[in-house]
């Protein structure tokens, strides 16, 4: 009897949908695997007789529930199927946005770039897919624990009237208010403000 694949899970980030599993212990030899998806009542092969322990399902529609399955094979024998269901628009992880930061005197000017849909070669981003898309920004003085959060209205934001000659760190994530779903934070960007431009009277 061939044992089934173990720890079968979907690793999906920005709609790059990779089904992953682990090969079970099997004394007779090396196992191969076949992964399929359900398409209108019929299971279709996506990865056949592969020695890999992952299969790319990024071509599936972003909308609706999908049933995927994988089994292990050896010679003419095979394991039972292991099934999972997956809804990309609900389940995909929202990766970190890009962010450009520029210092102008005692202000930080930030521009945000929504993460690209990873399986496409054009300019569609996660912001296109999710109507309620917004950004959360958090910032703090470098070396301190207190963090401040803001929700910009647009793809840019300005933090004004900061302390001069002070390093501030900023990071951003995507947020979907209608789903109460947050994406991953970007890596912090730390910049030092310069002088206060206000002229004394």
């Amino acid at each position: 009897m061939v044992p089934p694949p173990e720890n079968v899970r979907m690793n999906s980030v920005n709609f790059k949908n990779i089904l992953q599993w682990e090969s079970p212990a099997f004394a007779k030899g090396n196992l191969t695997f076949t992964a399929q998806y359900l398409s209108y009542r019929i299971f279709q092969d996506k990865c056949m007789n592969t020695t890999l322990t992952e299969c790319d399902f990024s071509s599936l529609s972003k909308y609706g529930d999908h049933t995927l399955r994988v089994r292990a094979e050896f010679a003419d024998e095979h394991s039972d199927w292991v099934n999972i269901t997956f809804c990309p628009v609900d389940d995909t992880i929202i990766g970190p946005p890009g962010m450009q930061v520029e210092v102008l005197a005692d202000s930080l000017h930030m521009r945000f770039l929504a993460p690209k849909i990873e399986n496409e070669y054009e300019t569609w981003t996660m912001k296109n897919v999710y109507n309620s898309w917004t950004y959360n920004v958090q910032y703090w003085k470098n070396g301190t624990d207190e963090k401040f959060q803001i929700t910009p209205q647009y793809d840019f934001e300005v933090l004004r009237n900061l302390e001069p000659w002070t390093t501030y760190c900023v990071q951003v994530r995507g947020f979907l208010p209608d789903r109460n779903k947050a994406g991953e934070w970007s890596e912090p960007v730390c910049e030092q403000t310069t002088h206060d431009e206000t002229v004394p009277s």
Epitope: S39, Y40, K62, E122
Partner: nanobody
């Protein structure tokens, strides 16, 4: 919400022509992949023709040279021009859309399209 509405089906003699249309609301054709599928009685739904956001097209072998898929982004309408129709083309024809898809690879599977119309019947018979 995306809605697709097919029209243009009907009864036609072998060798005749039909033009199917698919009007969309809540969606712009320039932003994704579109396709025509068909389902004959007792058979599975199958891909007929697809068109990507860049205008590139793919056809099932059984319709190559006879069918042409096109879209009018200004009218938000997808078309399927069907010439030299054969009895085996008889089926319910469905329009499908997958928003924010560039067509990095051909999509031929039902599971690769998220939105569907109700279908329009095409019957080829003498």
């Amino acid at each position: 919400q995306v809605q697709l509405q097919e029209s243009g089906g009907g009864l036609v003699q072998p060798g005749g022509s039909l033009r199917l249309s698919c009007a969309a609301s809540g969606y712009t054709y320039s932003s994704g992949c579109m396709g025509w599928f068909r389902q004959a009685p007792g058979k599975e739904r199958e891909g007929v023709a697809t068109i990507n956001s860049d205008g590139s097209t793919n056809y099932a072998d059984s319709v190559k040279g006879r069918f042409t898929i096109s879209k009018d982004n200004a009218k938000n309408t997808l078309y399927l021009q069907m010439n030299s129709l054969k009895p085996e083309d008889t089926a319910m024809y469905y329009c499908a859309a997958e928003p924010y898809c560039s067509g990095g690879y051909p999509r031929w599977s039902v599971a690769e399209f998220g939105y569907w119309g109700q279908g329009t019947q095409v019957t080829v018979s003498s």
